[in-house]
Structures are given as C-alpha cells and as structure tokens.
Amino acid sequence: RLSWYDPDFQARLTRSNSKCQGQLEVYLKDGWHMVCSQSWGRSSKQWEDPSQASKVCQRLNCGVPLSLGPFLVTYTPQSSIICYGQLGSFSNCSHSRNDMCHSLGLTCLEPQKTTPPTTRPPPTTTPEPTAPPRLQLVAQSGGQHCAGVVEFYSGSLGGTISYEAQDKTQDLENFLCNNLQCGSFLKHLPETEAGRAQDPGEPREHQPLPIQWKIQNSSCTSLEHCFRKIKPQKSGRVLALLCSGFQPKVQSRLVGGSSICEGTVEVRQGAQWAALCDSSSARSSLRWEEVCREQQCGSVNSYRVLDAGDPTSRGLFCPHQKLSQCHELWERNSYCKKVFVTCQDPNP
C-alpha cells in the first residue's frame, strides 16, 4: 500500500536545473525509477490536478504544486515504471519498455531565497574593511527573488544606497543585477513594493542598518568603486531594483483546447488561475511564443483575440510585451478579451 502520501516515501525531480521541477523519479525497494505518465490509467498527454502531488513538493522543501503531467522531453534512465490503482499509489507497478514510456513531470513553486543573513555585520568604524565587497537584495516578507532593496557591504560596513530619481544610472543597475546573478535590470521599485517599511514581525537583526552609501561612479566595473559612505539620511529614496531573474515568474497554461498545446491563455495569481486579457503592448507573437515554450510545445501556429462583448468578463492583465517581464498582474474586472493560442504539438 505504498503511496506518495507515506511519511517515508522518497521521490526526486530530475532533468532540470531545479530540485523543484522535472521528471518524477521514485525510490522503490530495488532503486530509483522514472514514473511513466501513462500510470494509473491516464493517457500520456493528460494533465492532473497538481495539488495531488502536494506531499512530494512539501518533502522536497518546495512550494505549492503548479503542474503535474507529461514531461515532454523524456530522458529514459535504466528503469521506468507504470503504476496502477489510484493516482499516487506505488503498490502495484510494473517495469515499462523504455520506448513506450512518456515521463511524468511535476513542477512545484520554487520559493524565493530572500532571507537575509541571520546576523548582519555589526556597524563599526575601525579597522577599515578588508573583506571583499558584496551586494544583497532584501525583499519584503514573501517578496520576490531578485527584487528588492539593494544593500552594499564592504567588509564590516553595510547599508542601503541613497538614490535620487534623476540619477542616470542604467549602466550601474545592469552591473548590480548582473553581480547579484539576477540577469539584467528591468526597473526601479517603489519602496512599498521593495519592502522598505519594517515588518513588525521581523527579527531585530533584519532591521535597517546604520550605514548608508551614495552612488559615486555609475559606470563602475568593480563594486569597490561604485559607492561612497555617507551619513545616513532620515528621508529620501533608497535604491530598489527589479532584475530580469525575478522569481516567481508568471505561470501560464492553455485551457479548453483539443490538446495541451492549444487553448485560452490563463495565468496564475497566488493559488488562482484566471484568463489573461489581451494587451495592446503584446500584439506581436513574442508573448505567445513564450507561452508555448512554457507548455513545452513547439512555436506558435496562431493566436486570436476572442471578442469581449460581455462587460462582466474578468481576468488578469500584464502591461509588458512578454509575461517574463511581468512581476505583477493587474485585475481587469470588465471587457477582458481572452486570447486563444495554438502552438505546434511536438507529439501530434
């Protein structure tokens, strides 16, 4: 009666660069096995309610399950299995011929690693710093990875960076995002989004630092030349960035089509899915290419805007051309025009 609900059940997700998504492999008495998506009487193209794999995501130290279904690029290891009974049960499994097995994929949300170090360097005036300079992005509680207030540490001195809106600093921002391994600069965050306000539940050591920095060279190519120490300002903005590597990205899916590679586009906001409304800034196929790629389908065949004659049609709106640039979705409560996209099906 083995199932993925059992406390000692072992699973892992492989063939991706994240422990929280990939091809599902399970450990049974004779080793690791890839699970075929045809298990439990399902068709190899069937998508399931992902929350059924909640325990797997939880034990992998990941977030909520986002998708459970075919992992379209199948890498077949030594052993693959088809299981029978209820979804998630591994009591009755048989070895499958590798060429008959389409692997089962699971994607769990990868929570943001935004927790600052548990102890920050204590403020000090002497000796002069010797440790290599480093940056840190501090997101608000529950905020995004690669988005937040920039803190600069030089040796034992650390603090935020004073920023004036008129500063011409595009090169610097790209350099900082890159240094943080967060891609390129997308935009400045207002302090409400960046989370400058102190969270009342925040432990003492995460509170504002007594040092502050000012930009001294916006074309710097090494961190030690970018900033100079100043007396902390009681007011004024601090540098807060959104970089292209932000997580979590907007997740999308296609619903109501004849296969997983076509349908009306929906996006995920928290735990809810809703229609993605058409946007004049996304009239090219770039947005839909991205959506097709996320479904692990081929390139876009066609897309059409469905008429929104209904004033009560609601959905979510992304103001950018690509969903990958969208770190926030806006609610549209009327005249939401849905978009029906058809992607090439890699397994017609």
């Epitope: 309610d49 929350s51 059924q52 325990k55 939880q58 949300l109 529950g142 979590p248």
Partner: nanobody
Framework: EVQVVESGGGLVQAGGSLRLSCAAS????????MYWYRQAPGKAREMVAA???????YYEDSVMGRFTIFRENAKNTVYLQMNSLKPEDTAVYYC????????????????WGQGTQVTVSA
C-alpha cells in the same frame, strides 16, 4: 501561526458511523491539500484519505467505499465521514494540512493536529 484541530472521535459499535472534523486556522490562505492519517497501537501511521485544493480525493484501499472525505472551503474545514466501521478502524485519527505561507509563494509546510481517538467495538 497555523493551528489544526480535530473533533468528532468517540466509541461506536461495529457497523456504525462517525464524522470527524478538522479545522485549520491562522495563516491558511494557501492550503494545497488536507489529509486524514491514523495510527493504531503498535502500528505505523498511515494515510487514510486526502482532498486537494482542486477537489481531487484519494482513499487508502481498506477504507474505499466506506469513508468519504469532503471539505467546506469557506471554513477551511475538512470532514471524514466514516460508515460501516470495523474494529480494525480503531486508531487515533490525525488531520494534516499542507500549507504555503507568504500568500502562496513560500515553502509548503505540513501541520498536524493533536489527534482524536476512534474506538470501534465488536
């Protein structure tokens, strides 16, 4: 902080019925799934039934057709309706919930209740 509280256990004769309730409170905006486990004396804890945020259910083979799990979303409450009870159903029944904090963007954590005793006499 999340709290999970079970109720409804008791003593019942074989063939009888009981309904267990489990209420989750606190930071429960993002419940991914809720479960009933049970542990009989000297045995390992086993999962009896599960219900997900998408409404899917799962039952352990020995209770299929006799037990029903259902939920009341507005109250973050899940129920286990147990019919045709057998002496081998005697155990402490625990409610378990997988919940993600930070408005669904945090890690999934599991939360357990204290358990409620179900005794089925022959």
């Amino acid at each position: 902080e999340v709290q999970v509280v079970e109720s409804g256990g008791g003593l019942v004769q074989a063939g009888g019925s009981l309904r267990l309730s489990c209420a989750a409170s606190g930071d429960t905006i993002c419940i991914s799934a809720m479960y009933w486990y049970r542990q009989a004396p000297g045995k390992a804890r086993e999962m009896v039934a599960a219900i997900t945020s998408g409404g899917s259910t799962y039952y352990e083979d020995s209770v299929m057709g006799r037990f029903t799990i259902f939920r009341e979303n507005a109250k973050n409450t899940v129920y286990l309706q147990m019919n045709s009870l057998k002496p081998e159903d005697t155990a402490v029944y625990y409610c378990n919930a997988d919940i993600a904090g930070h408005n669904c963007s945090g890690y999934l954590k599991e939360y357990w209740g204290q358990g409620t005793q179900v005794t089925v006499s022959a």
